[in-house]
């Protein structure tokens, strides 16, 4: 059962796993949610009636029954983890804590103009978990405007004290605001020889990489595969760090794989969702339950529905035993990973999907593409919306993309002459315009947010957000697309598609069926050569064939240029402008979304 509200002056008795320090009960709840075993917590606020050694403590708790006895205690705030909830969860914490000093290892001290600058510095520093900033009112002159970057083993402070005229806060890496580059490659036959901060068991290098990304101290990893010569180290995932943030030594070793934490791209990759099945593989761990199940998929469902289950092993039925049902072993461990992995025993293993909601919804795999053809099929581009105007008569105006449950990203030039959001309707999950009838459900628009530097499409800043009046319930036919990560600025996208209901040639009409075209990206230098009369800025991105023939056109404006990278679709561009449509040596020009990620997050996350 999902309980979101906090219980004031209430303490849960017993069930302690560990104690951490957090600046607020709200953040304690987030820490509990991300902890592999925590189901409930008790936080102690600052209070004259409470023992000060307990101030800011966040006690993480577990219980077989999923609850614990409640005791009245002033200043105690208790609650439940969001693991029991179905809504999406984020570790992003933008709060600034005034007059609180958070203790960690101070590894960098520098002058900053503001707390915001200090937080940005922390976000763009590979080691930084949180910071403390001495404001210009700090009594000691020599320490005014000093920004201290800090880290700890757990990512949370080792202590929190009251100190006037300082502010503290956390890195915004988990808010997708870091400029740190993401090195997505996994290097085969490679061992990184740096200090290990932790080790866990993992079935493959991908799971090992996701564990590293989630671990607060892990910067890179080495994984020993099941063919690794030393038996005791097979399936071992070594989580590593170094002072420089990069591996100091790369050793060539067969059957080992190494890679990097993708911390600063974590909003656009699955981190918690290990959805694969591992055949002929047994996961060992503490047994929670043994249940009969028809298949390994059914076993995974049982594990996902049992809040304490972290992973499972399914042993198929022998011949016609037990109505063809096999045994489903539901398991857990202290760190969420198997304590040992065995091969060759016939089991099928996997992980709970309960934690998938801790990943961004946009990372969910969608239907396989239909290769060839120009007409899309239902569910192929679930983020694509059609934006209609109802004045003077109802018609398709522009495309757009779902990027959040209340947000559509589109082009600013779509709103030329649009006086009010009241005349706009957003239709999602649509394949054919002919589906839209008088009684077709739509989303009203509460607010149009146009970039304040926008003047005209050709001069850039052609970007706008629509805030919907109601929230979108995600389904297979309507779900968000990931924004590109700032850390992925150097990624070369090779699988990019433009979609829309726009014209198929310059003098044409809106198409009934959603059209798609695969289009290669063009460098900005090349694009500039094709548009001598315009300035192609780094905030624009171009795509098109040299010979022309495929392009976005009138009516596609505001729609997505979607690129698939590492099995996840990213909104790389917004259809903006071009000379004609599909003309030879005239690529289409798109708004370069990665350059506006800060703007998008600022507008969509404003309180």
């Amino acid at each position: 059962e999902c309980v979101t509200q906090l219980l004031k002056d209430t303490c849960f008795e017993g069930g302690d796993i560990t104690t951490v320090f957090t600046p607020s009960a709200k953040y304690c709840q987030v820490v509990c949610t991300y902890h592999p075993r925590c189901l409930l917590f008790t936080f102690t606020a600052e209070s004259p009636s409470e023992d000060p050694t307990r101030w800011f403590t966040c006690v993480l708790k577990d219980s077989v029954t999923e609850t614990l006895p409640r005791v009245n205690r002033t200043a105690a705030i208790s609650g439940y983890s969001f693991k029991q909830c179905s809504h999406q969860i984020s570790a992003c914490n933008k709060d600034i804590y005034v007059d609180l000093d958070m203790k960690g290892i101070n590894y960098n001290s520098s002058v900053a103009k503001s707390a915001q600058e200090c937080q940005e510095r922390c976000t763009d520093d590979v080691h930084c978990h949180f910071f403390t900033y001495a404001t210009r009112q700090f009594p000691s002159l020599e320490h005014r405007n000093i920004c201290l970057l800090k880290h700890t083993q757990t990512g949370t402070p080792t202590r929190i004290t009251k100190l006037d005229k300082v502010v503290s806060g956390f890195s915004l890496k988990s808010c997708a605001l870091s400029n740190l580059a993401c090195i997505r490659d996994i290097f085969p036959n490679t061992v990184f020889a740096d200090s290990n901060i932790d080790s866990v068991m993992a079935p493959d290098a991908f799971v090992c990489g996701r564990i590293c990304t989630h671990h607060p101290g892990c910067l890179f990893f080495t994984f020993f595969s099941q063919e690794w010569p030393k038996e005791s180290q097979r399936n071992l995932c070594l989580l590593k760090t170094s002072e420089s943030g990069l591996p100091s030594t790369r050793i060539k070793k067969s059957k080992a794989l190494s890679g990097f934490s993708l911390q600063s791209c974590r909003h656009s990759i699955p981190v918690f969702c290990h959805s694969s099945f591992y055949h002929d593989t047994d996961f060992l761990g503490e047994e929670l339950d043994i249940v009969a199940a028809k298949s390994h998929e059914a076993c995974q469902k049982l594990c996902t529905n049992a809040v304490r289950c972290q992973f499972f092993t399914y042993t198929p039925a022998q011949a016609s035993c037990n109505e063809g049902k096999g045994k489903c072993y539901l398991k857990l461990s202290s760190n969420g990973s198997p304590t040992k992995i065995l091969h060759g025993r016939g089991g099928i293993s996997g992980y709970t999907l309960r934690l998938c909601k801790m990943d961004n919804e946009c990372t969910t795999k969608i239907k396989p593409r239909i290769v060839g053809g120009t007409a899309s099929v239902r569910g192929e581009w679930p983020w694509q919306v059609t934006l209609h105007t109802t004045s003077p008569t109802q018609r398709h105006l522009c495309g757009g993309s779902i990027i959040g449950n209340q947000w559509i990203l589109t082009a600013a030039h779509c709103f030329y002459g649009v006086e009010s959001p009241k005349i706009l309707r957003v239709y999602s999950g649509i394949l054919n315009q002919s589906e839209i009838k008088e009684d077709t459900s739509f989303f009203g628009v509460q607010e149009i947010i146009i970039h304040d530097q926008y003047k005209m499409a050709e001069s850039g800043y052609d970007i706008a957000l629509l805030k919907l009046e109601t929230t979108v319930n995600y389904t297979d036919s309507q779900r968000p697309i990931c924004l590109p990560s700032k850390g992925d600025r150097n990624v070369i996208y090779t699988d990019c598609w433009v979609t829309g209901w726009g014209y198929r040639k310059l003098r044409d009409k809106i198409q009934n069926t959603l059209q798609k075209a695969k289009i290669p990206l063009v460098t900005n230098e090349e694009c500039q050569k094709r548009y001598r009369g315009h300035k192609i800025t780094h905030k624009m991105i171009c795509a098109g064939y040299r010979e022309g023939g495929k392009d976005a056109c009138k009516g596609d404006s505001g729609g997505p240029l979607s690129c698939k990278h590492n099995e996840v679709w990213h909104l790389v561009g917004i259809t903006s402008w071009g000379e004609g449509c599909a003309q030879r040596e005239r690529p289409g020009v798109y708004t370069n979304v990665v350059e506006y990620v800060d703007w998008i997050l600022e507008k969509t996350q404003a309180v």
């Epitope: 600052e46 023992d51 000060p52 050694t53 307990r54 101030w55 800011f56 007059d99 000093d101 958070m102 203790k103 101070n106 403390t132 001495a134 700090f138 009594p139 000691s140 320490h143 201290l148 402070p157 202590r159 929190i160 004290t161 009251k162 100190l163 006037d164 005229k165 300082v166």
Partner: nanobody
Framework: QVQLQESGGGSVQAGGSLRLSCAGD????????MAWFRQAPGKEREGVAL??????FISYTDSVKGRFTISQDDAKIYLQMNSLKPEDTAMYYC???????????????WGQGTQVTVSS
């Protein structure tokens, strides 16, 4: 009432060393600033060294820079006093508060003091 307990004072020849300790109870844990003050007979109480217990900011009064060192572990703070001079003779107090300040009025909690006497 919060108890801060100083120890380590005593008599020493000029040029000698002493190490003062200050043990607190829970409140020193929650107070972000701790300090050593001293008061010589007939004089006002003056700040000697300050430490922000979580961030580790440290400040010294000019007259002790290079000779005294403030440090901490857990709920204790220390003052290592080297190259002592007769003018360092005073009652030394440990204080805790939420302001990193040279003003005695900024500190809510005080110890009873420990006497340091430096003879020439």
């Amino acid at each position: 009432q919060v108890q801060l307990q100083e120890s380590g004072g005593g008599s020493v020849q000029a040029g000698g060393s002493l190490r003062l300790s200050c043990a607190g109870d829970g409140y020193t844990y929650s107070m972000g600033a701790m300090a050593w003050f001293r008061q010589a007979p007939g004089k006002e109480r003056e700040g000697v060294a300050l430490i922000a217990t979580s961030s580790g900011f440290i400040s010294y009064t000019d007259s002790v820079k290079g000779r005294f060192t403030i440090s901490q572990d857990d709920a204790k703070i220390y003052l290592q006093m080297n190259s002592l001079k007769p003018e360092d003779t005073a009652m030394y107090y440990c204080a805790a508060g939420t302001q990193f300040s040279w003003s005695p009025g900024s500190y809510n909690y005080w110890g009873q003091g420990t006497q340091v006497t430096v003879s020439s």
